[in-house]
């Protein structure tokens, strides 16, 4: 009998409000034994996959997706899913990335890990979570 896969989580380092030109890393977490993590942007048609997985804790594995130089076009909603053979998980909640002018100011403080503001998340649409693994030829418009 197939196990029920827990939903992944998503976070961003150093936060979800990023100055233009700075870097951001999305961190996706799932259970032990994940083969592929996928970071989706806004809709399923735009995504990046990785099989470069870390052992995050005794019960979790994780993957990182780095954007070296954030542009305005990188702002938007992101979520994670993962493939643990033989099936894909449900999606994580959405995380919203905001891009600000590098000048900054008191009106737009960075959201740091552990800050009270926390990431902006929206419930994901889990109406259908059948995803073809990338190896089966689903076309990806890459995120970055």
């Amino acid at each position: 009998q197939e196990e029920d896969l827990p939903r992944p989580s998503i976070s961003a380092e150093p936060g979800t409000v990023i100055p233009l030109g700075s870097h951001v890393t999305f961190v996706c977490r799932g259970p032990v034994g994940v083969q592929t993590f996928r970071l989706e942007r806004d809709s399923r048609s735009t995504y990046n996959d990785t099989e470069d997985v870390s052992q995050a804790s005794p019960s979790e594995s994780e993957a990182r997706f780095r954007i070296d130089s954030v542009r305005e076009g990188n702002a938007g909603l992101y979520r994670c899913i993962y493939y643990k053979p033989p099936k894909w998980s449900e999606q994580s909640d959405y995380l919203e990335l905001l891009v600000k002018e590098s000048s900054g100011g008191p009106d737009s403080p960075d959201t740091e890990p552990g800050s009270s503001a926390g990431p902006t998340q929206r419930p994901s649409d889990n109406s259908h979570n059948e995803h073809a693994p990338a190896s089966q030829g689903l076309k990806a418009e890459h995120l970055y």
């Epitope: 890393t25 032990v32 470069d52 997985v53 052992q55 993957a63 997706f65 780095r66």
Partner: antibody
């Protein structure tokens, strides 16, 4: 079909150098961490080195036995993995395998290996 | 470094036997345990990951179990094509380490 083809092995004198190459095909190379694993004649398996992807800043890791002598590197544009081996010792004599890992460290796909002999 | 110990370096077995190969880690590896089969003259083949997950194409007579420091590879009914050396490997922490191997031979 996943293919990993190692080249560059051969006979080298102690304290000499050698550069191994691994040509990868049949999968998306740049999303995978890659490893070198070796096996001395008639002996068991020994993990040698690992390199991660751009998402992880191409981080590299080494076995203590090769640290400061071996350097793992990759060229994602050519789907190539390399192992530069300097100051070679007789105990480095082994078959060297290029390996694609899965699940964060399980060695899922192995090349056929290239033989390195260190002898005077 | 985590040491991986396979207590038996070789087993003499009969076809059809149930075979159990054990692997002990020097500390908890939280199920980050892989098993490999290496037939004479061939490259290693991944059989099992995460202690219990059978890789695609591996016959169902193979199974893995265990947790913490102690892990087991089982073959329910040994076939002639199973004659090989079997290695365990931990991937909880770098440096990744392999057991010394257990060679199965036919009586």
């Amino acid at each position: 079909e996943v293919q990993l083809v190692e080249t560059g092995g051969g006979l080298v004198q102690p304290k000499g150098s050698l550069k191994l190459s691994c040509a990868a095909s049949g999968f998306t190379f740049n999303i995978n961490a890659m490893n070198w694993v070796r096996q001395a004649p008639g002996k068991g398996l020994e993990w040698v080195a690992r390199i991660r992807t751009k998402n992880n800043n191409y981080a590299t890791y080494y076995a203590d036995s090769v640290k400061d002598r071996f350097t793992i590197s990759r060229d994602d544009s050519e789907s190539m993995l390399y192992l530069q081996m300097n100051n070679l010792k007789t105990e480095d004599t082994a078959m060297y395998y290029c390996v694609r890992d899965r699940y964060g460290g399980a060695m899922a796909y192995w090349g056929q290996g290239t033989s390195v002999t260190v002898s005077s | 470094d985590i040491q991986m110990t396979q207590s038996s370096s070789s087993f003499s077995v009969s076809l059809g036997d149930r075979v159990t190969i054990t692997c002990k880690a020097s500390e908890d590896i939280y199920n980050r345990l892989a098993w490999y089969q290496q037939k004479p003259g061939n490259v290693p083949r991944l059989l099992i990951s995460s202690a219990t997950s059978l890789e695609t194409g591996v016959p169902s007579r193979f199974s893995g179990s265990g947790s913490g420091k102690d892990y087991t590879l089982s073959l329910t009914s040994l076939q002639s094509e199973d004659v090989a050396t079997y290695y365990c490997q931990q991937y909880w922490t770098i440096p990744y380490t392999f057991g010394g191997g257990t060679k199965l031979e036919i009586k």
